[in-house]
Interface confidence: medium
């Protein structure tokens, strides 16, 4: 399917591809001796980046700070130093910059100040970092400002006192709409949720909260749920933890009208030292992580039905440390229903699944071709990959990365990885997958930063090295083949490969330092690999490519979720800019039901490799209990039940039947005795 | 076959530094996590934390946090444990130990140094 | 973190007898528990793994049960060369803990 990986051998050379990207490698030294630099992009396609650069020296009493801002409005390639535009102030790092969702161009840096002020101060920009305006808080803010997703101009923010303050002009005014405020979210539609402790605080009070909601801004509120341990939103769905009436177990609750009516949620009940955790949601379900008791480091992931209410098993032993909060659960938004994660094994070693059918099976990662098995396989012959994620970030194995996909790199897949029977602590490779995650590649020896540019016409990677560093590799055929170019004479300690979100981008920063006797230096190289891909992509350079594809003789073959989809894909040979306005080109087509496009219903699991569900042992033969919309009902069930956003018509269709019993619903949580709605005079 | 070998005996004065090397071989150095346990005398052992020789990167228990550096060099396969602000009861043998070649969430030792007896004294 | 506790502290026994020791966790380990022999002056040697799994080359004499809190290591017929200290050793979740230790000694 593809040769193995090769650097400058084998591979036809790009014409004068050094002249071409040295007349296009733009440097920028930055003039200070900042200890930490973090960058921000302003905007989409804007070429508008934001640079701020600190200076902290902890002095015996206060610590004396620096900051310097610095913008960019062509993709890196030049900066203006706009530290004036901040009145020369001291920018609170832990708060980073707040950039406006969308395009909205603005911009909120918080400022440090002085022990005894009655507030907080900001500084505003609504013109893509023009122009700042200085504006002094009445609190002191305790996070970073969140802006309403539907209206940039409605802020809200946390002060240390624990008060909620809401502003409806970007910033200028702020008005405080309620005390003792523990968390809060901006909602759709500009609703605002909340909890607030009753009695003493909110770490007092975990599990004796109140849930709040505004939908006017702080005007009027409406009490929707009582004894909340915490709350979360995930595509459309709220959810809350509650305590249950009897002991200190909580269980979760979910809504999906803004919390005017709540179902219980069949999914096991945890103890004080255990978690819920939403790995991932959409508009159609669910990914819930539900601990083990005991500090053992895994638990178990459920996958909800459309309601968000009934939950099936999907995998069991998932790595979720306690300790660091650290899962692998990882979508790779480059193929439709694919995630990747890892599993503690009964050796107490770490092995990698992906899943395809967005939880319906997982499986073990196919083993690169040509691969050997490394220490960690029994039999040298038979293994799997198995890739490095954030745990193995968190354990410092030699792991820059977490893996990388694009959603308009169609298929797209690069991660660092190893291959025996667990993730080895071996130095890692770098593997890539062009469809999904299917089959695997090694692209790259050794440990890389990378990134995708113009839509995956362009991989860009770095060798992650503690030595100072001046070569950057990049690939035009998806990681087959690499060129090496020389960026700088004076090598750099490199601290991170910079390019504009959405992978659109032709343009790369290389950002780090240099280090002489007594000063470090930052400095950045843009590159543009325009030059490089030098015509425009047209129709005979992309192919047709259906997706999931793994059996080309059969009929259902790419079927998932109940359709299949043909792709438009650039051919890796073809040399030419997808450009920035590239939509990705996909033609779906409906497939007929079958009993892959149903999950196990609540009480059934699917063995591993098989088609069927069978019931749970134990929850033979018992009726199954759910509570739906404060009601009390009994659910019978032959074991399947579609998987949300699944399209398939016709075919094999096991149906369902739901018995309401309409009893009341043994959670009290929402008694309507306790539900109340006042206004905020 | 797979072999640690431990530097000789230490006496150290209160508040000096010890450090303690462990050579490996037999095996892949860069492909097991190096891990310290000492023992004082007439004690049980008491698991000090871990290296990983192929980053760098280290996870040391609470306990000695602050005062404990684990480093290695790959170029001779040795890991090295560096402890600080000595204290008499800091006295004990020091035992160097393979991991496996997992990455696991813990793990146990089938391979130990012969350990390094280090005195504190005044 | 985890707390091992181990009885009996100190064990009389003779050659050819049936040797039993007992360790405890202070939470559920499932099985990730190790035992380990320790002679004067030397470093500790791995007798099982994951609370039964027996170590290549530890002679079948030596067996290990147990799961969640309770585990134990057994000796069928206890040999000359099996006056020893053991210890167990969770390897559950960091920081890794070792039980205070069981020696056995001639009757």
């Known amino acids: 399917r593809r040769g193995a990986p090769a650097e400058d051998q084998d591979c036809g050379r790009l014409p004068d591809f050094i002249a071409k990207l040295t007349n296009n490698t733009h440097q920028h030294v930055f003039d200070d001796l900042s200890g930490s630099v973090s960058l921000s992009w302003v905007g989409d396609s804007t070429g508008v980046i934001l640079v701020l650069t600190t200076f902290q020296v902890p002095l015996v009493i206060v610590s004396f700070g620096q900051s310097k801002l610095y913008r960019s409005e062509d993709y890196g390639k030049n900066f203006k130093d706009i530290t004036n535009l901040i009145n020369n102030t001291f920018i609170r790092t832990e708060f980073g910059m707040a950039i406006g969702p969308e395009n909205s161009g603005k911009v909120i840096l918080t400022a440090e100040v002085s022990g005894g002020s009655r507030g907080g101060r900001v500084f505003r920009s609504s013109d893509f970092a023009k122009n700042f305006v200085q504006t002094d808080l009445p609190f002191h803010p305790l996070t970073q400002m969140m802006y309403s997703p539907q209206n940039s101009d409605y802020l809200l923010a946390l002060s240390t006192e624990n008060g909620l303050w809401v502003s409806k002009n970007f910033g200028e005014k702020w008005e405080e709409i309620h005390k003792a405020v523990c968390l809060a979210k901006w909602g759709p539609n500009n609703i605002i949720f909340f909890t607030t402790h009753v009695n003493g605080s909110c770490k007092a009070d975990l599990g004796a909260l109140e849930l709040w909601r505004t939908s006017d801004l702080g005007k009027t509120f409406k009490t929707i749920g009582v004894k909340i341990y915490s709350f979360g939103l995930g595509g459309r769905f709220l959810f809350a933890s509650v305590m249950a009436d009897k002991d200190t177990t909580r269980r979760i609750h979910v809504s999906t009208d803004q919390g005017d009516t709540w179902s219980m949620a069949q999914l096991p009940s945890v103890g004080q030292e255990q978690f819920y955790s939403i790995l991932a949601a959409n508009e159609d379900m669910v990914f819930m992580h539900v601990d083990e008791p005991g500090d053992t480091g895994f638990g178990t992931i459920f996958t909800s039905d459309d309601r968000g209410i009934v939950y099936s098993k999907s995998l069991d032993r998932h790595l979720y440390t306690t300790t660091g909060g650290e899962t692998d659960f990882t979508n790779v938004t480059s193929l439709r229903g694919v995630y990747i994660t890892s599993t503690l094994s009964e050796d107490n070693s770490i092995q990698s699944m992906i899943t395809f059918d967005q939880g319906g099976r997982w499986e073990h990662l196919r083993k690169p071709e040509n691969s050997k098995c490394d220490a960690t396989a029994k039999n040298k012959n038979e293994c799997s990959l198995h890739i490095h994620a954030s745990y193995s970030i968190s354990q410092k194995l030699n792991v820059p990365m977490a893996p990388l996909s694009e959603p308009n790199a169609v298929g797209i897949v690069i991660a660092h990885g190893s291959v025996g029977d667990a993730i080895s602590v071996m130095v890692p490779d770098v593997y890539i997958s062009d469809d999904g995650g299917y089959s695997w590649a090694k692209m790259l020896e050794g440990p890389h930063y990378y990134t995708i540019l113009d839509s995956g016409g362009i991989i860009v990677a770095i060798e992650h090295s503690n030595r100072p560093i001046n070569v950057i590799k990049f690939s035009t055929d998806e990681g087959q083949c690499w060129q090496s170019y020389v960026f700088t004479q004076e090598p750099i300690y490199f601290t991170g490969l910079a390019s504009e979100p959405g992978a659109r981008s032709m343009n790369i920063s290389i950002w780090g330092f240099t280090e002489s006797f007594i000063t470090r230096q930052w400095v950045s190289y843009t590159v543009d690999f325009k030059d490089i891909l030098e015509r425009n992509c047209e129709e005979d350079d992309y192919t047709t490519w259906l997706a999931h594809s793994t059996d080309p003789g059969d009929y259902k073959d790419g079927c998932i979720l109940g359709y299949k989809e043909q792709f438009l894909r650039l051919r890796k040979s073809s040399v030419c800019q997808n450009g920035r306005d590239y939509v990705v080109a996909k033609q779906p087509s409906v497939c007929p039901c079958s009993l892959e496009d149903f999950l196990c219903d609540f009480g059934y699991f699917r063995p591993e490799n098989a088609s069927e569900c069978v019931e749970q042992p134990e929850l033979k033969g018992h009726e199954l209990e759910f509570c739906l919309y404060g009601k009390e009902e009994h659910l019978t069930t032959n074991g399947y039940r579609k998987i949300p956003g699944d399209k398939c018509q016709g075919g094999m269709n096991p149906a369902r039947e739901v018995k309401d019993l309409k009893k009341k619903c043994t959670s009290n949580f929402l008694n309507p005795t306790k539900q109340n709605s006042k206004s905020n005079s | 076959q797979v072999q640690l070998v431990q530097s000789g005996a230490e006496v150290k004065k209160p508040g000096a530094s010890v450090k303690v090397s462990c050579k490996a071989s037999?095996?892949?150095?860069?492909?097991?996590?190096m891990h310290w346990v000492r023992q004082a005398p007439g004690q049980g052992l008491e698991w000090m934390g871990w290296?990983?020789?192929?980053?760098?990167?280290?996870n040391y228990a609470q306990k000695f946090q602050g005062r404990v550096t684990m480093t290695r060099d790959t170029s001779i396969s040795t890991a090295y444990m560096e402890l600080s602000r000595l204290r008499s009861d800091d006295t004990a043998v020091y035992y160097c130990?393979?991991?496996?070649?997992?990455?696991?969430?813990?793990?146990?030792?089938?391979?130990w140094g012969q350990g390094t007896l280090v005195t504190v004294s005044s | 973190d985890i707390q091992m506790t181990q009885s009996p502290s100190t064990l009389s026994a003779s050659v050819g007898d049936r040797v039993t020791i007992t360790c405890r966790a202070s939470?559920?380990?499932?099985?990730?528990l190790a035992w380990y022999q320790q002679k004067p002056g030397k470093a500790p040697k791995l007798l099982i793994y994951?609370?039964?799994s027996l170590e290549s080359g530890v002679p079948s004499r030596f067996s290990g049960s147990g799961s969640g809190t309770e585990f134990t290591l057994t000796i069928s017929s206890l040999q000359p060369d099996d006056f020893a200290t053991y210890y167990c050793?969770?390897?559950?979740?960091?920081?890794?803990?070792f039980g205070g230790g069981t020696k056995v000694e001639i009757k």
């Open positions: 037999g095996y892949t150095f860069t492909g097991y996590y």
């Open positions: 130990a393979r991991g496996g070649p997992q990455l696991r969430v813990a793990e146990y030792f089938q391979h």
């Open positions: 290296i990983n020789p192929n980053s760098g990167g280290t």
């Open positions: 994951k609370a039964s």
């Open positions: 050793q969770q390897y559950k979740s960091y920081p890794i803990t």
């Open positions: 939470q559920s380990i499932s099985s990730w």
